[in-house]
């Protein structure tokens, strides 16, 4: 930052994703002052014409808001005075993705710092018993991804196989035709093993874990964002 | 290499019309804001119009309000400025600049609008 | 509207420093840039949100905003320098424009 007569300030933004269809969260953080109504926040974005958000004087100010975003953000307005000025913004489009920019100006100086948001569906994986099989099967199911991911199979006894050839992965679009139902069917699987199904795009990275033993069956799930540094 | 090139200027009578184009290369052109910036001669510079990235929102100066339509072809990489109705004080250097936040990175040479009769 | 004011000129020996100021009312709560443009050429950003330099512009080109005034400064002044200088800020869903300052390098 380089020095104006009134200073630059530090502002902070850490790069995220949102999943489409829910409420994401764009992390701005700044140097705190203590009167709120000394504080204005602008957001903007790569792109667009109008304001994402404009926030000062201690009130929302969207009369310069774009269309795109009218009725879908909101900033966390008790939290301004502490420094954050990170933006919530309601029912995630898949064309929200791209460079955002978080503009600052206190009483101690202005700042500003762009963001980059990724957009997409991720959703954690479900590994079941497949009963209904002739062999011992497994069936890993997540219900929303986008972009199309890949699926991978592990397992904790053979490390380092590849069970490529004994699984079969199909993707099936879902009803508002973005996103796709991921469903992936390991077979020939042997007792006392645990198995990971992950499944991986651009934007997330999921796993989803079975323990199969003669006595009991364990399942565990993980879901991970990729290139956020949150 | 980012670049902008207009074209389509020329000499034209008071009341008629005139399209302007200008060809973006170098850069995801349907992923920014384009602007028209027009500068009359020995004159400073004045904004014309604004265009979002897909096109959906458009801003324009007051004085060409009614009279000039931005659009683009993102297919193409062009912006366009359709100008109806022109006025001598119309007459200028027709510049497209890309938006860069609250500022305009990236300019074109020029093309040139004289409206006389 | 908004209004930026510049002066109509800017005289500086070489290898001084020359100051090219921009008025307008709460400036300081704008972000402005600022533009070269030389004769018959197409303007050049030279300075962008107050006190930022685009890729390629010399060190000596600086910005600083404060109150109602910006100041773009100019050290060790060069001939190639000598073009009109325009502010700019964005208002109320317009661009705003200086109304440009001719340097002369004497």
């Known amino acids: 930052f380089g020095i104006s007569g009134r200073h630059s300030i530090t502002v902070t933004t850490v790069a995220s994703a949102g999943n489409i269809g829910e409420d994401g969260i764009l992390s701005c953080t700044f140097e705190p002052d203590i009167k709120l109504s000394d504080i204005v926040i602008q957001w903007l974005k790569e792109g667009v014409l109008g304001l994402v958000h404009e926030f000062k004087e201690g009130k929302d100010e969207l009369s310069e808001q774009d269309e795109m975003f009218r009725g879908r953000t909101a900033v966390f307005a008790d939290q301004v005075i502490v420094g954050n000025a990170s933006l919530r913004l309601k029912n995630v489009q898949l064309t929200d993705a791209g460079t955002y920019k978080c503009y600052i100006i206190t009483s101690k100086g202005k700042g500003n710092a762009n963001l980059e948001y990724k957009t997409g569906a991720f959703s954690m994986p479900e590994v079941n018993v497949d009963y209904n099989a002739s062999s011992e099967t497994l069936r890993c199911e997540a219900p929303r991804w986008f972009p199309q991911p890949t699926v991978v199979w592990a397992s904790q006894v053979d490390q380092g196989a590849n069970f490529s050839e004994v699984s079969n992965t199909s993707f099936e679009l879902n009803s508002e035709n973005v996103t796709m139902k991921v469903v992936s069917v390991l077979y020939n699987v042997t007792i006392n093993n645990t198995y990971s199904c992950m499944i991986e795009n651009d934007i997330a990275k999921a796993t989803g874990d079975i323990k199969v033993t003669e006595s009991e069956i364990k399942r565990r799930s993980h879901l991970q964002l990729l290139n956020s540094k949150a | 290499e980012v670049q902008l090139v207009e074209s389509g200027g020329g000499v034209v009578q008071p009341g008629r019309s005139l399209r302007l184009s200008c060809a973006a290369s170098g850069f995801t052109f349907s992923s920014r804001s384009m602007n028209w910036v027009r500068q009359a001669p020995g004159k400073g510079l004045e904004w014309v119009s604004a265009?979002?990235?897909?096109?959906?929102?458009?801003y324009y100066a007051d004085s060409v309000k009614g009279r000039f339509t931005i659009s683009r072809d993102n297919s193409k990489n062009t912006l366009y400025l359709q100008m109806n109705s022109l006025r001598a004080e119309d007459t200028a250097v027709y510049y497209c600049a890309r938006k860069r936040w609250y500022g305009m990175d990236v300019w074109g040479q020029g093309t040139t609008v004289t409206v006389s009769s | 509207s908004y209004e930026l004011t510049q002066p109509p000129s800017v005289s500086v020996a070489p290898g001084k420093t020359a100051r090219i100021t921009c008025g307008g009312n709460k400036l300081g709560d704008k972000w402005v840039h600022w533009y070269q443009q030389k004769p018959g050429q197409a303007p050049v950003l030279v300075v962008y949100e107050d006190v930022d330099r685009p890729s390629g512009i010399p060190e000596r080109f600086s910005g600083s905003n404060s109150g109602n005034t910006a100041t773009l400064t100019i050290s060790r002044v060069e001939a190639g320098d000598e073009a009109d200088y325009y502010c700019?800020?964005?208002?109320?869903?317009?661009?705003?424009f200086g109304t440009g300052t001719k340097l002369t390098v004497l």
């Open positions: 700019q800020v964005w208002d109320s869903r317009t661009y705003v």
């Open positions: 265009i979002s990235g897909s096109g959906s929102t458009v």
